[in-house]
């Protein structure tokens, strides 16, 4: 209706004696600004006077006069929009209707607001969700239809009279729509909160109690159970009896079904609150609980760990790792089911007790070949000693051990023999698959680990073999000790250092490079004739007759070896010179006569000189002196002289007779 003033404010405001009231209010006048404002308490319209009668709590006029009551009642508004009011303190008799008489230049309006002032602080109101379930977060709300700037209050939450730990969020509203104070508490109720009293307490600024509201929590929860066991420690031996009882300590709503579980699995035909286990076996060890259901769901008791104790079962051995390489580490683990756990272990290797090893694990930091074999163990607990299980096999792999090269031939070995060697070893794991030989040669291997050397050389000194599996192990080299006849026999002249001259002292040495065996004998030979049996052949004074072809022989038990023939050359001055005549020493004149100077010399004569019977040297220097034609006066004694690098020699006189020819005689 366009003829109405427009007001907005809470319809009713609530307060209590001594508190205050804050009235949020807005308005819009029909025309112009507010010129007059009167606050009435329970106004009544007087038709006669056409005015409102009632107690005037506040009045503002054009001249600005303020009644004494205005100290308690304040108009906090303005001339066009705001009509907010405050009454501080508020009294019980302020209850009723407040009338706001507004006048502008041309228009008037009476706006009514209800004020409800109680004698004592009224209680807040707790609001709960329709259903509360355990562990589900809910918000509890405490609402009080009061708020005033001049009168601070607080709302506190209590559970069974004890302040709640959770932080509450308090909010206030002083708006034209609503005036209230609200506290919200987020809370996760547990089953134990069921039936408990929650209080929202109104307090003044000093924490003084003003009023409260209480509610009883109805927390829906699964059944809460307690399990009891006889014996109480739930430790029994095989054959004993065990009783478990399930007690419901709380359920909301009431429970409907009961069951028992072992290790999470339901036990069949067990639907009462008591579980009787008679003559238990070790298989009945485990975690037991009872389960009771209601409409919310199933509830489970705490688990009871039933331990059925028994002596260790036959043990097994686990090896990390087999096969093992020599020098690597290996761990053995003794596994045996037992309750209580074994406290002592006895270990066996190939049936023999391993002294000083009494733990579940045996750690060998460096495996040796002898560690191979079967390992077994026995576990022991307070109830007894278990049995030894089948055991586990440790395979230790290692290179061939104690490899030796063995000569199969009868000794000694002679040069040219066929030698057979074998490669032997003490042990190996895995098996030997191949062999190697040093030095390499074009030798035959007739079978695995056997070497055949045909026509063994004198210089085949040592041979080594290796036996190989995944690794090769070398034997120490073995000496073949090949025996052979003396080698490289030769004649060596020791003295003189230069050429041999007749008369010199001469020594010849019979040398050889090697011989096995070392014991040798020497033989000197010239033209098939034995000369001596020493390593040296000595001539005190050599003569040309000693020249010739010499050989030395060296022999040992294997055989004998001759040197190459060595020529002994003796140098000497020409000797045994003689003049020979051809055709004879009597020649007819006119014929030809040849004189030859014959000699024995080494080196041969290099220069000849001829002499006549007068020792007159003739002008001829060759070995032959040719007279042609020969004359009678050529008759006479001739001699020659031969010269070589060593010296000179002369012949005796030889007489040439030249006789007359028949013609000459005939002429005479």
């Amino acid at each position: 209706d366009s003829s109405k003033w427009v007001f907005e404010h809470p319809e009713t405001l609530y307060a209590w004696e001594g508190a205050c009231v804050w009235i949020p209010c807005t308005y819009r006048a029909l025309d112009g600004d507010l010129e007059s404002f009167i606050l009435f308490h329970n106004p009544e319209y007087n038709k006669n006077t056409s005015k409102f009668d009632g107690t005037r709590l506040y009045e503002s006029t054009k001249d600005g006069k303020v009644p004494s009551e205005q100290k308690r009642v304040q108009f906090l508004g303005d001339k066009n929009k705001n009509c907010t009011l405050s009454i501080h303190p508020v009294h019980l008799n302020d209850s009723g209707q407040l009338g706001l008489r507004m006048e502008s230049k041309t228009e008037k309006w009476m706006e009514r607001i209800h004020l409800n002032v109680s004698e004592r602080p009224f209680p807040p109101h707790i609001q709960l969700p329709p259903e509360i379930q355990e562990s589900q977060e809910v918000t509890l709300t405490c609402l009080l239809n009061f708020s005033c700037y001049g009168y601070p209050i607080q709302l506190q939450w209590l559970l069974e009279g004890v302040p709640m730990r959770q932080a509450a969020v308090t909010s206030t509203s002083l708006t034209i729509k609503s005036v209230f104070t609200r506290s919200e508490l987020k809370f996760s109720p547990q089953w134990s909160h069921h039936g408990k009293i929650v209080t929202c307490q109104l307090q003044d600024a000093d924490g003084k109690f003003l009023s409260n509201d209480t509610v009883q929590l109805n927390v829906k929860h699964t059944p809460k159970l307690e399990i009891k066991v006889t014996p109480s420690d739930a430790i029994v031996r095989e054959g004993d009896s065990v009783t478990m009882t399930c007690e419901v300590s709380s359920s909301n709503p009431e429970y409907t079904t009961v069951s028992w579980l072992k290790d999470g699995t339901s036990l069949k035909k067990q639907n009462t609150f008591t579980l009787n286990l008679r003559e238990v076996t070790k298989d009945q060890s485990g975690k037991y609980c009872c389960q009771v259901s209601n409409d919310v769901g199933p509830g489970r008791s705490e688990e009871v760990f039933l331990q059925v104790q028994y002596a260790p079962e036959p043990s097994t051995v686990q090896i990390l790792h087999s096969p093992a390489v020599e020098g690597s580490q290996v761990e053995f683990l003794c596994m045996s089911l037992a309750n209580p756990l074994p406290t002592n272990y006895t270990w066996y290797h190939n049936g023999k007790e391993m002294q000083g090893r009494t733990e579940e694990k045996v750690h060998i930091p460096k495996i040796l070949p002898w560690h191979a074999g079967t390992y077994s163990c026995v576990a022991e607990n307070i109830l007894g000693t278990g049995q030894r299980g089948p055991g586990a096999e440790l395979d230790v792999q290692y290179p061939p051990k104690k490899v030796t090269t063995v000569i199969q031939n009868p000794m000694p070995i002679r040069e040219g023999d066929t030698v057979t060697l074998s490669c032997n070893y003490n042990s190996s794991n895995p098996s030997v698959t191949r062999y190697e030989w040093k030095p390499h040669g074009a030798w035959e291997e007739p079978s695995l680990g056997v070497l055949k050397i045909q026509n063994v050389g004198w210089d085949n000194t040592t041979i080594a073999c290796a036996a190989c599996n995944s690794w090769c192990s070398w034997a120490s080299p073995v000496a073949l000790n090949v025996q052979y006849a003396p080698r490289d026999v030769r004649v060596r002249k020791i003295k003189p250092l230069s050429e041999i001259h007749s008369g010199n002292s001469v020594s010849l040495q019979c040398d050889f490079s090697s011989s096995h065996p070392k014991e040798v004998q020497f033989f000197w030979e010239k033209n098939g004739r034995l000369l001596g049996k020493e390593s040296q052949l000595n001539f005190d004074s050599i003569s040309p007759e000693d020249a010739g072809s010499y050989s030395c022989w060296v022999n040992n038990s294997i055989g004998q070896t001759a040197s190459k023939a060595w020529t002994l050359e003796v140098l000497y001055a020409p000797r045994r010179l003689r003049v020979s005549m051809s055709p004879g020493d009597q020649v007819m004149e006119g014929k030809s006569a040849t004189l030859t100077c014959e000699s024995d010399a080494n080196p041969p004569v290099s220069h000849y000189t001829w002499f006549d019977w007068n020792n007159q040297s003739l002008p001829y220097h060759s070995q032959k002196l040719r007279l042609e034609p020969v004359k009678v006066q050529h008759s006479g004694a001739y001699w020659c002289q031969g010269t070589n690098s060593v010296g000179k020699g002369r012949s005796p006189l030889s007489t040439l007779t030249v006789y007359y020819s028949p013609e000459t005689i005939g002429r005479r």
């Epitope: 270990w347 290797h349 391993m354 090893r357 694990k361």
Partner: antibody, heavy 122, light 107 residues
Framework: QVTLRESGPALVKPTQTLTLTCTLS??????????VTWIRQPPGKALEWLAL???????YYSTSLKTRLTISKDTSKNQVVLTMTNMDPVDTATYYC??????????????WGQGTMVTVSS | EVVMTQSPATLSVSPGEGATLSCRAS??????IAWYQQKPGQAPRLLIF???ARATGIPARFTGSGSGTEFTLTISSLQSEDFAVYYC?????????FGGGTKVEIK
């Protein structure tokens, strides 16, 4: 019968190097599982382990003396040698060599030498 | 390193009585523990290895026990030749370590 015998100088000057020899008889050092160790004992005090050498020539040393110790063996002479550098009077002690058992892992010191007393003094 | 602590340092016992010697390891290991006996002027002698195994030729009155960190050597009835210093030693970890010793003397 296996025996061990220690030998070395009875007197060493400070800062000098001590060389001790342990001669083993009755069993070769090269035998698999054979390990020789050195232990010392200052007068009136407890035993202190120094070093060990095994058949594989693996060596182990005391943490506190590691930088001063060297252990080695001469298989041909069947001897184990321990050298200790930078000797000090606090190193005065009886030095023992012993065999460390090795069966299914390391064992205790089952055989001891008679010990050799070493005095460090200037 | 593993520290071995022996207690008591000295134990006074009458001949024929029993004696209990304790050895504590600073860290839990295996039972790789040995006990040695040492008489004045002599080298130590192995009594027990593997915490409880008697060495060759050791009389049955010597008993070793224990595991983890606590080990015990018990001499059931002391003979005159048993009065000596006793050492425990661990050989589970490098470096090997000895205890400080317990002197068993005649009361």
């Amino acid at each position: 019968q296996v025996t061990l015998r220690e030998s070395g100088p009875a007197l060493v000057k400070p800062t000098q190097t001590l060389t001790l020899t342990c001669t083993l008889s009755g069993l070769p050092l090269s035998t698999s599982g054979m390990a020789v160790t050195w232990i010392r004992q200052p007068p009136g005090k407890a035993l202190e382990w120094l070093a060990l050498i095994d058949w594989d020539d693996d060596k182990y040393y005391s943490t506190s003396l590691k930088t001063r110790l060297t252990i080695s063996k001469d298989t041909s002479k069947n001897q184990v040698v321990l050298t200790m550098t930078n000797m000090d009077p606090v190193d005065t002690a009886t030095y023992y060599c012993a065999r460390m058992g090795y069966s299914y892992g390391w064992d205790a010191f089952d055989l001891w030498g008679q010990g050799t007393m070493v005095t460090v003094s200037s | 390193e593993v520290v071995m602590t022996q207690s008591p340092a000295t134990l006074s016992v009458s001949p024929g009585e029993g004696a209990t010697l304790s050895c504590r390891a600073s860290q839990s290991g295996s039972r790789n523990i040995a006990w040695y006996q040492q008489k004045p002027g002599q080298a130590p002698r192995l009594l027990i290895f593997g915490a409880s195994a008697r060495a060759t030729g050791i009389p049955a009155r010597f008993t070793g026990s224990g595991s983890g960190t606590e080990f015990t050597l018990t001499i059931s009835s002391l003979q005159s030749e048993d009065f000596a210093v006793y050492y425990c030693q661990q050989y589970n970890n490098w470096p090997l370590t000895f205890g400080g010793g317990t002197k068993v003397e005649i009361k």
